[in-house]
């Protein structure tokens, strides 16, 4: 799925909101520092595609995400904000629901999310370029222009 | 606990560069936008700019975009700050300050500033 | 870029006073319902400290009389009962679009 047109202040606002406090509840417990982050994103089409990946995919030692609280409500807010993006998930929630497996909160998982709350922060802060500027690559947001 | 070390004071020469440092421990460096602000004597704050460790990208305020650069040394998780060109107007504490955890686009650490004075 | 001013310039009140700070931007700092305003407090020597995040959320270990209103372009900081160690500078900051600016402060100051 193209991320390119959806309504990244709505998902920004969604997740500011409530995702931020779901993801907070699931990593509690958990130090900051405690993993090292590996996965970034460079602009908010591909932020949104990392999260999506992390937040649905199951991985090796984490299957179950999915069912989280804050992968709902992202799930339910890409499908609010990004037209189209329901219609592409389908099949991926059908495959999704075969592969289910009882939850379990595993290090690999807290790891993952931890990797997700970067993402995010990402997302919602890209530094932006700014008019007269040049020094920034990535240009994404041209359509919003209140992108803080 | 999520803690930002500034360099010490630095007397210059006008014309002069001064390179102020900030090294960040206990958070994950490189996923947080960090800032510079600047503070002249008995005035209020002012933004310089701010990088995103990850990649090195950076967002200048206008005024200080042709003097002042941004850097970091993700090795050594390590913010730095130069500006050029040295005027007395340039006498400021100068902070470095990270970004919240959420993007809400507050700053929740500080460091606890460098004065930099700007002298003949 | 946005300008925000903050009013009065200095405010003397006593210990015990209600304080309201005001903060007034030139255009709107909300977007998609949220308003990206946030409040810090400075004291001599030391670097400012967050008071309160968009608009009304208190800072971690922020006391509870401290509180903050207002949307779109008109902002209140208000603390209930002031107490010694509140007297000091204030500053809005607005991040919604940037640059990022800071208003000129308000200096609470013991009457």
């Known amino acids: 799925y193209d991320f390119t047109n959806c309504d990244f202040e709505k998902i920004k606002a969604a997740y500011l909101s409530t995702i931020s406090k779901d993801l907070i509840t699931y990593m509690s417990g958990t130090k900051s520092t405690e993993f090292n982050n590996t996965v970034s994103c460079s602009n908010r089409p591909h932020c949104l595609t990392e999260i999506q990946s992390l937040t649905f995919n199951p991985t090796a030692g984490c299957a179950s995400l999915a069912k989280e609280m804050f992968a709902m409500k992202t799930k339910a807010a890409l499908a609010i904000w990004c037209p189209g993006y329901s219609e592409t998930q389908i099949n991926a929630t059908q495959a999704m629901k075969k592969a289910r497996k009882s939850k379990v909160t595993t290090n690999k998982c807290l790891e993952q999310v931890s990797q997700l709350q970067g993402l995010w922060r990402r997302f919602n802060r890209p530094l932006l370029k700014q008019q007269g500027s040049s020094d920034y690559k990535d240009d994404d947001d041209k359509h919003h222009h209140h992108h803080h | 606990e999520a803690q930002l070390v500034q360099s010490g004071a630095e007397v210059k020469k006008p014309g002069s560069s001064v390179k102020v440092s900030c090294k960040a421990s206990g958070f994950t460096f490189s996923t947080y936008n960090m800032h510079w602000v600047r503070q002249a004597p008995g005035q209020g704050l002012e933004w310089i700019g701010a990088i995103y460790p990850g990649n090195g990208e950076t967002s200048y305020n206008q005024k200080f975009k042709d003097r002042a650069t941004l850097t970091v040394d993700k090795s050594t998780r390590t913010a730095y700050m130069e500006l050029s060109s040295l005027r007395s107007e340039d006498t400021a504490v100068y902070y470095c300050?990270?970004?919240?955890?959420?993007?809400?686009?507050?700053?929740?650490?500080w460091g606890q500033g460098t004065t930099v004075t700007v002298s003949s | 870029e946005i300008v925000l001013t903050q009013s009065p310039a200095t405010l003397s009140l006593s210990p015990g006073e209600r304080a309201t700070l005001s903060c007034r931007a030139s255009e709107s700092v909300d977007n998609s319902g949220l308003s990206f305003m946030h409040w810090y407090q400075q004291k001599p020597g030391q670097p400012p400290r967050l008071l309160l995040y968009r608009a009304s959320n208190l800072g971690s270990g922020i006391p509870a009389r401290f509180s903050g209103s207002g949307s779109g372009t008109d902002f209140t900081l208000t603390i209930s009962s002031l107490e010694p160690e509140d007297f000091a500078v204030y500053y809005c900051?607005?991040?919604?679009?940037?640059?990022?600016?800071f208003g000129q402060g308000t200096k609470l100051e013991i009457k």
């Open positions: 300050a990270r970004e919240d955890d959420y993007g809400e686009g507050y700053f929740d650490v």
């Open positions: 900051q607005q991040i919604n679009t940037d640059p990022l600016t």
